[in-house]
């Protein structure tokens, strides 16, 4: 979002509206309230970064994220018998990704058409609300999953039903929290007509008076409360998890566990480094610059960071892969275009001897596997 200047002589209205019924001047329209952007911002809004690079990334995220998260949700809801806390958190993570990714065709079209939003104000607000909602939901559910992974290692035996109920309660609380914290994004007018560029932007330009204090305070609060604090919890959980795994006995089974745990940690770390840290950092820096200087010199970086934050919808399936046997089986079979039933039959007939030596918690059966380490 960049600072838009309200050129209304009525005062500083939050609403930038195009009055199509007013004096039409040849090919143009007369605007009643007008927002102006600086040249650098205009060059970003009309340049290849936003009209070519962004749609390419969003297309990749959509093409990868929709089927993988769709399959994950289906596996967690209908193909996993035991709903462990990890399954519950991952199901919510997949749902959050899906709710964000389903709107991407509109986002792609918006950027391809020169950052011109033609789908109305309500859809823009939904898109933005879900966009940020997904990011913060992902952080929180990832934190829950990380803490739960550590808890399983520390306390392997526990009342499964009670644990599942707690996980459901936490998940509902997270959804409620995210709904509450994203209310400002649904309430605030996100579409602004820029006469100089003849485009209606969605979230990319916001009225100056809104940005000056409110947006900085809003994203700073989110960065501290919904990014930094959960990031600290996640990091702590993984540090403790590594310590625990290092000190544990090294048999073939625990070595596999350890390798998978490391892969999961690397995946989550990558997600934080690529998706969450740059976007949250630049959201705060960007709005601070606007608040203090009236314009942001990091606008292009901010745009790229927000774009990269959506890659979490592509990285999340790797988390499911390293945590859930069910998802791992279905993902492998989907990629190899085989049915789970066929694979099961092959495994029963060909590898029964090998299976008998393995731990029951590592059974390949897609309906009886445990999803904990």
């Amino acid at each position: 979002t960049i600072q838009g200047t309200n050129r209304s002589s009525k005062g500083r209205s939050l609403i930038g509206k195009v009055d199509g019924t007013s004096h039409v001047t040849g090919k143009g329209v007369t605007v009643e309230t007008v927002f102006s952007v600086d040249e650098f911002s205009a060059s970003v809004l009309t340049g290849k970064l936003t009209t070519v690079f962004l749609p390419i990334v969003y297309t990749i995220v959509f093409v990868v994220g929709l089927p993988s998260n769709g399959m994950a949700l289906w596996v967690f809801l209908f193909r996993t018998k035991k709903k462990h806390p990890a399954v519950i958190y991952m199901a919510n993570l997949a749902l959050a990704d899906l709710l964000s990714v389903i709107w991407f065709p509109l986002k792609i079209a918006y950027h391809i058409h020169g950052n011109n939003w033609i789908y109305g104000e309500a859809l823009c607000n939904v898109l933005i609300g879900f966009f940020y909602g997904n990011m913060y939901c992902s952080i929180l559910f990832m934190t829950c999953l990380s803490v739960q992974r550590y808890w399983v290692i520390v306390n392997p035996m526990g009342h499964s039903r009670k644990k599942a109920n707690i996980a459901i309660g936490i998940s509902l609380a997270i959804w409620l929290l995210i709904l509450l914290v994203t209310i400002p994004l649904y309430v605030v007018k996100q579409t602004i007509f820029i006469p100089a560029l003849n485009i209606t932007t969605c979230h990319d330009v916001l009225p100056e008076q809104l940005l000056v204090g409110d947006m900085f305070n809003y994203f700073l609060s989110l960065a501290i409360g919904v990014f930094l604090f959960p990031a600290f919890l996640t990091a702590s959980a993984y540090v403790l998890m590594i310590r625990m795994l290092r000190s544990s006995a090294m048999d073939e089974n625990s070595e596999k566990k350890r390798k998978r745990a490391i892969k999961l940690i690397v995946t989550v770390l990558a997600m934080y480094l690529i998706c969450f840290t740059p976007s949250n950092l630049l959201l705060v820096v960007h709005y601070f610059l606007i608040k203090s200087q009236g314009q942001s010199h990091v606008y292009a970086l901010y745009i790229v960071a927000l774009c990269l934050s959506t890659l979490n919808s592509c990285i999340d399936p790797f988390v499911y892969y390293f945590v859930s046997h069910d998802f791992r089986d279905h993902a492998k079979n989907a990629l190899l275009c085989r049915s789970v039933r066929t694979v099961k039959q092959m495994q029963v007939s060909l590898t029964s001897k090998k299976h008998s030596r393995k731990s029951s918690s590592y059974s390949s059966s897609s309906t009886t596997v445990k999803t904990s380490y």
Epitope: T5, N6, T25, K27, G28, E39, N198, Q293
Partner: antibody, heavy 119, light 106 residues
Framework: QVQLVQSGAEVKKPGSSVKVSCKAS????????VIWVRQAPGQGLEWMGV???????YYAQKFQGRVTITADESTSTAYMELSSLRSEDTAVYYC?????????????WGQGTLVTVSS | EIVLTQSPATLSLSPGERATLSCRAS??????LDWYQQKPGQAPRLLIY???SLATGIPARFSGSGSGRDFTLTISSLEPEDFAVYYC????????FGGGTKVEIK
Amino acid sequence: QVQLVQSGAEVKKPGSSVKVSCKASGFSLSSYGVIWVRQAPGQGLEWMGVIWGNGNTYYAQKFQGRVTITADESTSTAYMELSSLRSEDTAVYYCARWRGYKDYPFDYWGQGTLVTVSS
Amino acid sequence: EIVLTQSPATLSLSPGERATLSCRASQNIYKYLDWYQQKPGQAPRLLIYNTNSLATGIPARFSGSGSGRDFTLTISSLEPEDFAVYYCLQHNSGWTFGGGTKVEIK
């Protein structure tokens, strides 16, 4: 070089309209906006409205409904029409070039057109 | 609407002296303030844009400073041709001119 040449002085009756032209040379009207400013005798400058290179316009609240700014790219001329003239509209009307972006000033100005409204 | 207040209304100085003109905005306009010079019977001429950027062809004796709400135009050493009316213009939110400061020969 960049130049803005305005039409000559006009004397108008109250209630009538005036159309002032501003011919641009040295730059394209499709790439630049043109703003209009007026100055009553012995008074300061007053911003009236703008037309962007793409034809979009915006008018100061004070003049909305009375002013119309247009542009003809083929002749590189911008126009400002003010209707329902009153004696207090007697002023020198200036056009100026504007890049259309927030961080750009009004860098080149026309010589001004004196419009006298008198019965 | 943002109001720009210029002071003093009139500044009486001699050639060679330093002139300091002030422009105060009713609210924060960041760096988005320009200065124009107008001589009798002439169109305004851009001197300084975005607080401190010198316009093309303007002598280095003209300089601008400030940010937020308080801005200053300084003419380090007045030349005979500098005696004119000076206007500030804000373009952060709407376009508003100040009332002007007349720099006259003492």
